[in-house]
């Protein structure tokens, strides 16, 4: 057992049919030495009396606040939470497995460039009883700050027959700087929390490996006399990196239709600008990425060819 | 130790391709280290992040742009000076910052140089001729050094009595290859933004 | 199986034009770029041009505009590729190429020979 | 116009041991570089697409590198049946352009 916070503490549990479980003691938190009483939640039941209660902890009905009072006065709360471990594995039921970069990811981050901000989120078929708190550090030995804001519920979408909540949180490395050469991982802690259950999952990489630009921003077409070529200029994103010719980016340029499957022209440039053919009814498109250490791409930008 | 922005530098030039091939050549050594040491521990992920410039050259500090010198946080260890002159400045303006900056690059080169030397030398007893280091790399490290032209001591090859723990070899491989590839940025970066300055 | 085939080898006298024809086969027509590449013998590959068939847009190398022209016909799945103004040096295997990219080529025809003798 | 210049123009080989062939732009394409094989009276086939991009059906001994005006098509080990010319093709800018070809000879 450990405590997760102030009067709220973890039962580390082996889950599996006719388990032992933990044996836990609680104490009264109180300078009272006689008539203490305790009940769980919100029974009237008494469970035991004393200044501590020794209780045996094997399923979720044996997890919740347990209160001791005296006279009919509150003296202290103990919130036990559980957390369950099944063949050796902590579960993972609050969270969705995203699988994207691989499986049993649950937690994903990205940054829009090198400044130490980055954004986290996760997914979960849960709407309701549940608390996520959030903690990161650089390196795990010997950490440096990296300060977290809370958890936000950031979108909700149906999937078939059940809807799926999406959470994230914004977090800023301390003392960052751009153009350092990353050797410590940031590592991300979220204790997830849902009625008595406790989770914690964690995520670690280097801000390096989770760039993804903004999209290019300011897209304009020219089109060129007597061709059928056009010409598409664009600028940085505003939330890039500067100076630029230090974190330049590289850009895809593609002329595609509505479906696609659909015949594009497509072209790849260090350029803020880049001629291609224009068809009817399709779309010019801009993405763009690291130069020089190739992570994701930003989503497109696009505009019409019309 | 920042670099100052400078009038445009025809001499630049050939630093900026030399320094575009050296990213290009050691990313596809790691891959290529990546894919055949498979079974071993070279994923990002799986090595331990090492500097072997670290303590003995300043690269990232003594190349920042000048627009990050206001950045208290990218200002904290910059000690080390290395006074120069190098053929990639080819302009007698070019600042002693600049000539720092590239000579720690210089620097870094002929440690990896040496590394890689030293490594090739072990890999190339392995019974089972698993991976060598590709000798283009070893050619675009030399050419760079080269286009940088700074005079500097000679660092003797490693050698080593004992003999080579192959298992071993090839994780410092990985691990100094991931480690150069971010170097390699570090100094594409770097060659870029004096290119335009 | 995406498949070209183009008509048979040809000889022309300097000055005349040759028509040569590309027929396509599996997939629509209209979902390819169509290019013409030509190789002299012994020689290297040149691209001539293209066509984008769902619409008849057309783009020449520089080198050969106002004496190439290329057509679509989507109700047979054919390309055309007709060069005028013959001359000796016009001799080559002219090969249709498609993409659904505009600018590089996945499928090949097998080539016809042009021969361009007096 | 783009000028390709592909090295070297032949390219002696035992079989079984790597090669590499090395193709040069006249400016910066970026990786609007494509690699194709040519046998004796047939079609050239495309290997690589964007400098690296590897082709279905294409085997993996062909690997493509390079960005900017320096390319390099590798074969890891070659076999009897690669022994073809091969071309590379820039699609920066129209006109598109060919190297002059690489011919890949048993030694």
């Known amino acids: 057992i450990w405590e997760l916070k102030k009067d709220v503490y973890v039962v580390e549990l082996d889950w599996y049919p006719d388990a032992p479980g933990e044996m836990v003691v609680l104490t009264c938190d109180t300078p009272e030495e006689d008539g203490i009483t305790w009940t769980l939640d919100q029974s009237s039941e008494v469970l035991g009396s004393g200044k501590t209660l020794t209780i045996q902890v094997k399923e979720f009905g044996d997890a919740g606040q347990y209160t001791c009072h005296k006279g009919g006065e509150v003296l202290s709360h103990s919130l036990l939470l559980l957390h369950k471990k099944e063949d050796g594995i902590w579960s993972t039921d609050i969270l969705k497995d995203q699988k994207e970069p691989k499986n049993k990811t649950f937690l994903r981050c990205e940054a829009k460039n090198y400044s130490g901000r980055f954004t986290c989120w996760w997914l979960t078929t849960i709407s309701t009883d549940l608390t996520f708190s959030v903690k990161s550090s650089r390196g795990s030995s010997d950490p440096q700050g990296v300060t977290c804001g809370a958890a936000t519920l950031s979108a909700e979408r149906v999937r078939g027959d059940n809807k799926e909540y999406e959470y994230s949180v914004e977090c800023q490395e301390d003392s960052a700087c751009p153009a350092a050469e990353e050797s410590l991982p940031i590592e991300v802690m979220v204790d997830a929390v849902h009625k008595l259950k406790y989770e914690n999952y964690t995520s670690s990489f280097f801000i390096r490996d989770i760039i993804k630009p903004d999209p290019p921003k300011n897209l304009q077409l020219k089109p060129l006399k007597n061709s059928r070529q056009v010409e598409v200029s664009w600028e940085y994103p505003d939330t890039w990196s500067t100076p630029h010719s230090y974190f330049s980016l590289t850009f895809c340029v593609q002329v595609q239709g509505k479906s696609k499957r659909e015949k594009k022209d497509r072209v790849f440039t260090d350029k803020t600008s880049a001629t291609v053919i224009c068809r009817k009814n399709a779309s010019i498109s801009v993405r763009a990425q690291d130069r020089y250490y190739s992570s994701s791409w930003s989503e497109w930008a696009s505009v019409p060819c019309s | 130790r920042n670099l100052p922005v400078a009038t445009p530098d025809p001499g630049m030039f050939p630093c900026l391709h030399h320094s575009q091939n050296l990213l290009r050549a050691v990313s596809n050594m790691l891959q290529k280290a990546r894919q055949t040491l498979e079974f071993y521990p070279c994923t990002s992920e799986e090595i331990d992040h090492e500097d072997i410039t670290k303590d003995k050259t300043s690269t990232v500090e003594a190349c920042l742009p000048l627009e990050l010198t206001k950045n208290e946080s990218c200002l904290n260890s910059r000690e080390t000076s290395f006074i120069t002159n190098g053929s990639c400045l080819a302009s007698r303006k070019t600042s002693f910052m600049m000539a720092l900056c590239l000579s720690s690059i210089y620097e870094d080169l002929k440690m990896y140089q040496v590394e890689f030397k030293t490594m090739n030398a072990k890999l190339l007893m392995d019974p089972k001729r698993q991976i060598f280091l590709d000798q283009n790399m070893l050619a675009v490290i030399d050419e760079l050094m080269q286009a940088l032209n700074f005079n500097s001591e000679t660092v003797p090859q490693k050698s080593s009595l004992e003999e080579p723990d192959f298992y071993k070899t090839k994780i410092k491989l990985c691990i100094l290859l991931h480690a150069f590839r971010i170097r390699a940025v570090t100094i594409d970066r770097v060659m870029s933004y004096l290119n335009a300055s | 199986q995406v498949q070209l085939v183009q008509s048979g080898a040809e000889v022309k006298k300097p000055g005349s034009s040759v028509k040569v024809s590309c027929k396509a086969s599996?997939?629509?027509?209209?979902?390819?770029?169509l290019h013409w590449v030509r190789q002299a013998p012994g020689q290297g590959l040149e691209w001539m041009g293209w066509i984008d068939p769902e619409n008849g847009d057309t783009e020449y190398a520089p080198k050969f505009q106002g004496r190439v022209t290329i057509t679509a016909d989507e109700s047979t799945s054919t390309a055309y590729m007709e060069l005028s103004s013959l001359r000796s040096e016009d001799t080559a295997v002219y090969m249709c190429?498609?993409?659904?990219?505009?600018?590089?080529?996945?499928?090949w025809g097998q080539g016809t020979l042009v021969t361009v003798s007096s | 116009d783009i000028v390709m210049t592909q090295s070297p123009l032949s390219l002696p080989v035992t079989p079984g041991e790597p090669a590499s062939i090395s193709c040069r732009a006249s400016q910066s394409i970026s990786i609007n570089l494509h690699w194709y094989q040519q046998k004796p009276g047939q079609a050239p086939r495309l290997l690589i697409y964007?400098?690296?991009q590897s082709i279905s059906g294409v085997p993996s001994r062909f690997s493509g590198s390079g960005s900017g005006t320096d390319f390099t098509l590798t074969i890891s080990s070659l076999q009897p049946e690669d022994f073809a010319t091969y071309y590379c093709?820039?699609?920066?800018?129209?006109?598109?352009?060919f190297g002059q070809g690489t011919k890949v000879e048993i030694k």
């Open positions: 964007f400098a690296s």
């Open positions: 093709q820039q699609s920066n800018s129209f006109p598109l352009t």
């Open positions: 190429a498609r993409n659904k990219e505009l600018r590089y080529f996945d499928v």
């Open positions: 599996g997939g629509t027509f209209s979902d390819y770029y």
